[in-house]
């Protein structure tokens, strides 16, 4: 019996077409991906073969405006309308609290959305009972197909899902409710979920029962011959584990924004053993038709985001002064902006003895594409924050060893004075550059402001200790020559969408007047 | 739990036909198919002929001309049937699903006046 | 019709030992084989399938290896309950199986 198994994961807000690069789609007929575009595949498909199913493995929360103005109403909305079968949730679905998942995305779903290793406690488990389940059973054909959920359980440090969720061990969760499908003579079995690709593998080797695993949270890029576009496969499509019972599993995941749809067809026996699995990720170019019907919905969609683009967020009373004169070559104001915004975003009280998880943010210079000036009445908007930040990247978490943040540090004034872009503002940090001394060992004073403590102050940057920063994606994947935080990054948790993390800061302070503080000297 | 069970004579004379049922439990005839195999006495085991899920049959050429395969979905059970019968046809007879993940015990066939 | 070349066609082992058949198919298989074992009373069990994959509830003593023509059944360490008679099963194409392997007691 052969299934097809249909994979999106990490799409973020990626409704419309894109770029090659997952940016703002420019040229159209270059463009890819959307949702219009993957209907068109998916019924292509859905019309070819019997017994198929589409999935997504979370994080379709946050990375365009679409989210910032619908909040989820469009996943829900567009994820009905290509009938997809079931979602497990990803880290991001938390970003705008519980009541951000549950109002627009699980009440509004016509889909099963899994997690079996978040547990509701208190006052949220009667609110939240049956909205989101441990793992759902598909008919498929003549079949019944298991499908169980998994989040990463670093959500609390990654999100905002409050203190009633409580995120348990992805294997030690999994394998009861794998258990019970067993026990329903479900012997067909897809773990779908969100903790990223190491954990993926993990939950094939370990946990008994598990036929397939269907990923996403790391983005990761998988394919079988000679790959269609920019990206580099971290494996072959599907990658199989061997479980500790003996048997061979696949693994995939489809890379993230929509650009992919995941392809991978499995043959069952009669126990429900895999027999056999083959596929690759189909690359959604614009040699797939835009569908018309889903086209003219999102085109109707859309009409609210332009409104909202010239809306003010906020005021400024000073200047932000984002140019590449000041930026590129000393502390500016509008780095400064960034990083408190960067640091606000992050705030998670998850443990009594640290003031918050994360107190540190680096910002490449070169990433600040434009000043905003306070003489229009102070009025700040998104249509002038995208010209801030126009690449629509992500401001990421990563742990790091001091002696890299150095190293980074180092490069980052290695060739100064040419107004280059890998010159580095940044957020917690103090530091001092002896620009008379030779590259790589200009760095003279590097202070970092604690965590584990009540009262933040500033204390000199330890060589061997792990350290979390917040960055923008550029630099965690190597980016502006940074290719030791990319190389010796220890983990790598994707954030929110740059704009949506400023915006959303200077909604907040609602008057705003960085200064230049000596951050940089 | 997924089994197969044969049935059906065990004693047949030459020159008659065969016919021997299967009966599935645990999977659905209408997603997998299910192969027949016979092992001679102290010989070995050899391919009959197979029924796939939407109902078509494929034998082993040796036996074409003499065997057929048919099935009753909604009875869960498989029907191979086998003329003129001889006593070299003399086996135990198996019904296995389609990937061999399940066997009947089998039946032993003697084919004698 | 693909052909299946099983060897030894018998061995003796002791209890303990390590067991390594072999089958050679006529034409590449891809990965479609299973090594089945048949007790003297003739129930037929799969151990094996799809080349590598261990069936459930057999014992991790049980390996399988190989790719296109050529496949391997490894006993790591003979148990009293594996003397048997073993058979590597194609299913790329018609059914064909291998002449078989009996195991015995040294």
């Known amino acids: 019996w052969e299934l097809t198994i249909l994979h999106t994961n990490d799409v973020h807000s990626r409704l419309e077409q894109t770029s090659e690069d997952s940016s703002k789609c420019v040229n159209a007929s270059r463009c890819m991906g959307g949702v219009a575009r993957l209907f068109t595949k998916v019924q292509q498909i859905r019309r070819a073969e019997p017994n198929v199913l589409l999935l997504d493995a979370g994080d379709q929360y946050q990375g365009t405006i679409w989210f910032t103005v619908y909040k989820g109403a469009e996943v829900a909305h567009f994820m009905n309308a290509l009938r997809y079968d079931a979602m497990a949730l990803g880290n991001h679905e938390f970003d705008n609290g519980v009541e951000g998942l549950i109002e627009p995305l699980l009440k509004e779903a016509k889909f099963p959305i899994l997690s079996a290793n978040i547990k509701a406690k208190g006052p949220l488990a009667s609110q939240i009972s049956g909205l989101y389940l441990p793992y759902k059973v598909l008919p498929v054909g003549d079949e019944v197909v298991g499908i169980v959920g998994y989040t990463s359980k670093e959500t609390p440090f990654l999100s905002n899902p409050g203190t009633n969720l409580v995120f348990e061990d992805e294997i030690t969760a999994l394998q009861p409710e794998v258990d019970k499908l067993k026990t329903l003579n479900v012997n067909k079995i897809i773990a779908l979920g969100h903790s990223g690709f190491e954990m993926d593998k993990l939950i094939a080797q370990k946990v008994r029962g598990v036929d397939v695993v269907v990923g996403g949270h790391s983005n990761t890029f998988l394919y079988t011959g000679n790959p269609p576009s920019k990206e580099v496969p971290a494996g072959k499509y599907p990658f199989i584990v061997t479980s500790d019972d003996g048997r061979k599993v696949p693994v995939v995941q489809a890379y993230a924004f929509g650009k992919y749809l995941g392809y991978l067809k499995i043959e069952f026996d009669e126990r429900g053993n895999v027999i056999s699995s083959h596929g690759n990720p189909i690359l959604l170019n614009s040699s797939i038709p835009e569908d018309p019907s889903i086209k003219a919905d999102i085109n109707k969609w859309r009409i609210k985001l332009d409104n909202y683009s010239t809306q003010e967020l906020g005021k400024t009373i000073v200047y932000l002064d984002g140019s590449s004169q000041s930026c590129r070559f000393r502390e500016c104001n509008m780095g400064n902006l960034i990083c408190d915004a960067m640091i606000n975003n992050n705030l998670r009280h998850t443990d009594e003895m640290f003031w918050n998880h994360v107190s540190m943010c680096i910002l490449n210079g070169g990433g600040i594409r434009s000043p905003i000036d306070e003489r229009n009445n102070g009025t700040i908007t998104w249509e002038n924050l995208a010209a801030v930040l126009p690449f629509g990247g992500t401001f990421d978490l990563v742990q790091l060893k001091g002696s890299t943040l150095k190293k980074a540090f180092e490069h980052s004034v290695h060739r100064y004075g040419q107004s280059t872009g890998e010159f580095l503002q940044v957020g917690g940090i103090h530091v001092v550059y002896d620009l008379s001394r030779k590259p790589g060992d200009r760095v003279v004073k590097l202070d970092v402001l604690c965590t584990k403590c009540r009262v933040p102050s500033y204390d000199p940057l330890k060589m061997d200790e792990v350290y979390k920063v917040i960055l923008p994606n550029f630099l965690a994947n190597g980016g502006d020559g940074f290719q030791m935080i990319k190389d010796e990054l220890l983990r790598h948790d994707s954030g929110d969408q740059d704009i949506n993390v400023v915006s959303t800061y200077i909604s907040k302070m609602k008057v705003i007047y960085p200064a230049v503080e000596g951050r940089i000297k | 739990e997924v089994t197969l069970k044969e049935s059906g004579p065990v004693l047949v004379k030459p020159t008659e036909t065969l016919t021997l049922t299967c009966t599935v439990s645990?999977?659905?005839?209408?997603?997998?198919?299910i192969q027949w195999v016979r092992q001679p006495p102290g010989k070995l085991l050899e391919w009959l002929g197979v029924i796939w899920s939407g109902g078509s049959a494929d034998y082993n050429a040796a036996f074409i001309s003499r065997l057929t395969i048919s099935k009753d979905t909604s009875k869960s059970q498989v029907v191979l049937t086998m003329t003129n019968m001889d006593p070299v046809d003399t086996a135990t007879y198996y019904c296995?699903?389609?990937?061999?993940?399940?066997w009947g015990q089998g039946t032993l066939v003697t084919v004698s006046s | 019709d693909i052909q299946m070349t099983q060897s030894p066609s018998s061995l003796s082992a002791s209890v303990g030992d390590r067991v390594t058949i072999t089958c050679r198919a006529s034409?590449?298989?891809?990965?479609?084989l299973n090594w089945l074992q048949q007790k003297p009373g003739g129930a037929i069990k799969r151990l094996i399938y799809?080349?590598?994959s261990l069936d459930s509830g057999v014992p991790s003593r049980f390996s399988g290896s190989g790719s296109g023509t050529e496949y391997t059944l490894t006993i790591s360490s003979l148990q009293p309950e594996d003397f048997a008679t073993y058979y590597c099963?194609?299913?790329?194409?018609?059914?064909?199986f291998g002449g078989g392997t009996k195991v015995e007691i040294k």
């Open positions: 034409q590449d298989i891809g990965d479609r």
């Open positions: 645990g999977f659905s005839l209408k997603s997998y198919g």
């Open positions: 296995a699903g389609q990937y061999g993940s399940v």
């Open positions: 099963l194609q299913y790329a194409g018609s059914w064909t």
């Open positions: 799809a080349t590598s």
